[in-house]
Interface confidence: low
């Protein structure tokens, strides 16, 4: 057979051959960082000629060209500098907002050597819409400027850029945009492993959090997978074994998949793993219908037995057939378990496709994905039951459009990636799941279904019961620590009689815990300013309780996410390297931030936290409270910047017994505690015998109701001092 000519050098770069100079061999060019090869690859045809994939004209000389990042096409309500047609590696672009608009995202972004901008899309927002301004990523054009419930925005990319993410997004009832942020990228760009690992890991841990069996189990089951426990994940690993994948690369595909399997089995969830290799045809090495798919050693041994030569007779890339074999597997399992059964309906499915190119036979893989979505009944409510991760490896012939089309679209998550080489893939799978931090105490997960109990909706919520007087409330922030208010403990220090009542799936009345130790902020002294005519002062009104035993995590008992921690960072799906300031900017991002607290009867009540100018006018009212503060000259003496303020308009006010409870917000279907209930000017439960009835303050009341909550962003040093070993704090 003829061989292909050897005059294929690239100036300034190098190349590798998958099968020497023989027909079928793939020649892959690479360039130093900051440059990209043009063309990226060539294929040796049976005629003995080199062919450049996608090229229309005859062979051109291969060169290394400088990588550039796309320029903003439009930037609303602000300006950016410098204004260039595209930006060189290392070049910066800066953003500023017009008056009245607040900058969200990164004020300065730098072009990275992979042709991608660092940081996050800059947006100038005034917080006016039902959903936040979704922004316009660099290189994109957006149509649609209304951000009300049901409004849609559409995106396209300028010139030859490729769109990844959602081309259309809708503002949903929960104030979140559907789909995932669109990004415009150069066709030659790729992802760095250090970006992919957390992005993939975050999305995956979100899914694992949802899959985690949360029923009470009475004894530790260790790492053994208990199939009868609720919550099941089917993981389908699809490994490309087509001609363009070298034997060495295939080994790395296998090794990466083994890493993934090892990690996934470390989570205490029920998992079945399918292994499928494919080229022109798929080969199922392990099916989820096989009991061995639940056994880690069996799965890994079937991976090890995957043979590169299995596909030597058919060397195309038939991604459709690979995905269709997943569909057939699902179909068989559905028939076996019964379409209507919970056993079938409660399985979550994750497909990881590892490929090095675009499909070139067998029809559109999108058709198979549509079939899969249909059989799993994927709709807005069941969106969590399917995740498809499309990972392209090698910059050669990977088709961004196809990968993007196959990958799932979920808010704040990415499911489509292109990595430079298999080494990078290995790195990603090594770092994507830090099991030790994630397993069972995943934070801020509340059951939002209509038939969930109050405790399932807010499983962090606890009641602190002294033997006499009022109760207080608090929040689990780990499996042994509760955050509450210091003023709950002002009557002496004997906590041996106190009990903390924590949710328990076996009892609608919860389970009582003794307190091992109470850590009360030394700065708290209700009479500290008595001499100034301030009869009560609630600065530093914060305390931590360590429970005598660890709480078993369940649907009814689970910590809330504390901002400025790694746990919250994962839940917010923010990049690694985020800071406490980033969390504050993301969570308290409007003049009026909708938040909640839990009432005496367990229901979730709504408030609005006032920020900026509105905070000042919210706090101002305290000067009208002549009983508690007879001769107050400066409101700031009472309402320091340690406090968040609510209680205006239609806000509910907390009752006396609700002190210490969490003030929390919902983001991305997870819950974050930003404050704790401290004090207020009005008690809606006064004179009410029934904990279900609250009295609204009469409109004529002077002063009007106001409520003040300790702002956890202002208590960071104290929290870090006492919880440094319990939570993983981010830099301030």
């Amino acid at each position: 057979a003829p061989s292909c000519p050897q005059n294929v050098n690239i100036s300034g770069g190098t190349f590798t051959l998958s099968h020497g100079w023989a027909p079928g061999s793939l020649l892959t060019y690479s360039c130093p960082q900051g440059l990209y090869p043009s063309p990226a690859s060539r294929l040796c045809k049976s005629s003995g000629q080199w062919q450049t994939p996608g090229a229309t004209r005859s062979l051109s000389k291969a060169v290394c060209k400088p990588v550039r990042c796309p320029a903003p096409v439009s930037f609303e309500n602000g300006i950016y500098t410098p204004r260039l047609g595209s930006y060189p590696v290392g070049g910066n672009v800066s953003f500023e907002c017009e008056d009245g608009f607040i900058l969200r995202g990164s004020p300065v972004r730098q072009c990275r050597p992979n042709g991608m901008w660092d940081g996050e899309t800059a947006v100038c927002d005034n917080g006016a819409g039902h959903c936040p301004n979704p922004g316009i990523s660099l290189g994109a054009v957006r149509t649609g400027f209304r951000f009300g419930h049901g409004d849609k925005v559409r995106y396209r990319c300028s010139s030859n850029l490729v769109l990844t993410g959602s081309s259309e997004r809708e503002c949903q009832g929960n104030g979140v945009w559907s789909g995932t942020e669109p990004i415009c990228r150069q066709p030659y760009s790729y992802d760095f492993p250090e970006d992919v690992a957390p992005a993939l890991g975050t999305s995956f841990s979100h899914m694992l959090g949802a899959t985690n069996p949360t029923q009470k189990t009475k004894e530790s089951l260790g790492r053994k997978i208990q199939i009868q426990r609720s919550g099941h994940l089917n993981l389908y690993l699809l490994l490309d074994c087509s001609q363009s994948v070298s034997e060495n690369d295939f080994l790395i595909f296998k090794e990466s998949a083994s890493l993934m399997v090892d990690r996934i089995f470390s989570f205490e969830i029920n998992v079945s793993v399918a292994i499928i290799t494919f080229a022109s045809e798929p080969k199922v090495l392990m099916s989820v219908l096989n009991d061995n798919s639940r056994d880690m050693t069996e799965v890994i041994s079937s991976l090890e037995n995957a043979n590169y030569k299995d596909h030597e007779n058919g060397t195309g890339t038939n991604t459709y057939a690979a995905l269709n074999s997943v569909y057939l597997m699902m179909n068989n399992q559905m028939r076996l378990l019964g379409m209507e059964t919970m056993a079938w309906q409660e399985i979550r499915h994750a497909i990881i496709l590892l490929t090095d190119g675009k499909s070139n036979m067998g029809g559109s893989p999108k058709t198979a994905v549509d079939h899969i979505r249909e059989i799993l009944n994927i709709n807005q409510k069941r969106n969590d039951y399917l995740d498809i991760y499309a990972i392209g490896v090698g910059k050669l012939d990977v088709d961004w459009r196809e990968l993007n089309e196959l990958g799932s679209k979920k808010d704040g998550e990415r499911h489509a990636f292109i990595l430079q080489d298999t080494k990078a893939l290995h790195q990603v799978f090594e770092h994507m799941l830090d099991v030790s931090k994630l397993t069972d105490t995943i934070c801020g997960v509340g059951n939002m279904s209509a038939n969930a109990s109050d405790q399932e909706r807010t499983p962090w919520h606890v009641t602190i019961k002294p033997k006499s007087q009022e109760t207080c409330r608090g929040a689990l922030i780990s499996d042994q620590w509760v955050l509450t208010a210091a003023h709950c403990f002002r009557d002496g220090n004997d906590h041996s009689l106190w009990r903390v009542n924590v949710g328990d799936p076996k009892s609608q009345w919860g389970k009582e815990f003794l307190i091992e130790k109470a850590v009360i902020s030394p700065g708290f002294d209700v009479f500290a300013k008595k001499n100034q005519g301030i009869l009560e002062f609630y600065g530093d009104d914060i305390a931590l309780l360590k429970l005598a035993q660890k709480v078993k995590m369940s649907t009814h008992a689970r910590p809330i996410c504390l901002p400025c921690t790694m746990e919250a960072n994962l839940a917010l799906r923010r990049p690694q390297g985020s800071t406490c300031r980033d969390h504050e900017n993301e969570l308290l991002n409007k003049q009026s931030v909708p938040a909640h607290f839990v009432a005496l009867n367990g229901s979730k009540l709504n408030i609005n936290l006032k920020m900026g100018v509105e905070w000042t006018s919210c706090a101002e009212v305290v000067s009208q409270e002549k009983t508690m503060f007879p001769n107050l000259t400066d409101v700031r003496e009472v309402v320091t910047d340690q406090f968040l303020c609510s209680g205006t308009q239609e806000d509910e006010s907390p009752c006396k017994g609700e002190s210490g409870g969490a003030v929390f917000l919902e983001r991305r279907f997870r819950f974050f505690q930003v404050g704790l209930v401290s004090w207020g000017l009005y008690n809606p439960c006064l004179g009410s015998a029934d904990k279900n009835s609250r009295k609204r303050a009469p409109r004529s009341k002077v002063p009007p109701p106001r409520d003040f909550h300790i702002n956890l962003f202002r208590m960071q040093p104290w929290l870090r001092q006492h919880l440094g070993d319990v939570l993983n704090f981010l830099p301030l």
């Epitope: 109990s453 076996k506 009892s507 609608q508 919860g510 015998a689 029934d690 904990k691």
Partner: antibody, heavy 119, light 106 residues
Framework: QVQLVQSGAEVKKPGASVKVSCKAS????????MYWVRQAPGQGLEWMGI????????TYAQKFQDRVTMTRDASTTTVYMELSSLRSEDTAVYYC????????????WGQGTLVTVSS | SYELTQPPSVSLSPGQTASITCSGD??????TCWYQQKPGQSPVLVIY???KRPSGIPERFSGSNSGNTATLTISGTQAMDEADYYC?????????FGGGTKLTVL
């Protein structure tokens, strides 16, 4: 000592209503929940509902939702259970029972009140 | 709706160990209580929270609960233990009783 004393036996016609009382003594009335359970002749126990003596809030079993009303009078530490639209199959002994929390069980029971529904 | 199933009757001789079972879907994930009822009397709580005994209940009464089955065990059964026994649990704010088991001491 804890005592739950129920009102006496009743004979009612179909379609009528009956109101059974249960007077609690010997403990802090508002600290414990009060439950109503019935037992038809020769049959098992059937839960009817719960009342919170402190606030008066109630939860009824689905089966009795439309016909039962539970109330309490904190001043006399008495709880009441009224069942309307009586039918012959409502003939049973009706018990009140006290409980601290669900998982602690019903730790004290009244002596029972026999309600006979007959035309 | 949630159901608890008990055997209608269990018979044994004095001094033997009686085991009365109560089964329900994932019952091990819920707390179970047991009641004893003698003819013409009100029920008496003998076990709460799966395996705890109220004061005044003899040590020969014990309970366990895992998987789909809760069990009441009476070791060294005596003639005075002859009665109906009911298991009970909670399912989303509703108390559910088993059908009852008649324990006969021969």
């Amino acid at each position: 000592q804890v005592q739950l004393v129920q009102s006496g036996a009743e004979v009612k016609k179909p379609g009528a209503s009956v109101k059974v009382s249960c007077k609690a003594s010997g403990y802090s009335f508002t600290t414990y929940y009060m439950y109503w359970v019935r037992q038809a002749p020769g049959q098992g126990l059937e839960w009817m509902g719960i009342i919170t003596p402190s606030g008066g809030s109630t939860t009824y079993a689905q089966k009795f939702q439309d016909r039962v009303t539970m109330t309490r009078d904190a001043s006399t530490t008495t709880v009441y259970m009224e069942l309307s639209s009586l039918r012959s199959e409502d003939t049973a002994v009706y018990y009140c029972a006290r409980g601290y929390e669900g998982s602690y069980g019903f730790d004290h029971w009244g002596q029972g009140t026999l309600v006979t529904v007959s035309s | 709706s949630y159901e608890l199933t008990q055997p209608p009757s269990v018979s044994l001789s004095p001094g033997q160990t009686a085991s009365i079972t109560c089964s329900g879907d994932k019952l091990g994930n819920k707390y179970t209580c047991w009641y004893q009822q003698k003819p013409g009397q009100s029920p008496v709580l003998v076990i709460y929270q799966d395996n705890k005994r109220p004061s005044g209940i003899p040590e020969r009464f014990s309970g366990s609960n895992s998987g789909n089955t809760a069990t009441l065990t009476i070791s060294g059964t005596q003639a005075m233990d002859e009665a109906d026994y009911y298991c009970q649990t909670w399912d989303s704010s509703t108390a559910v009783f088993g059908g009852g088991t008649k324990l006969t001491v021969l």
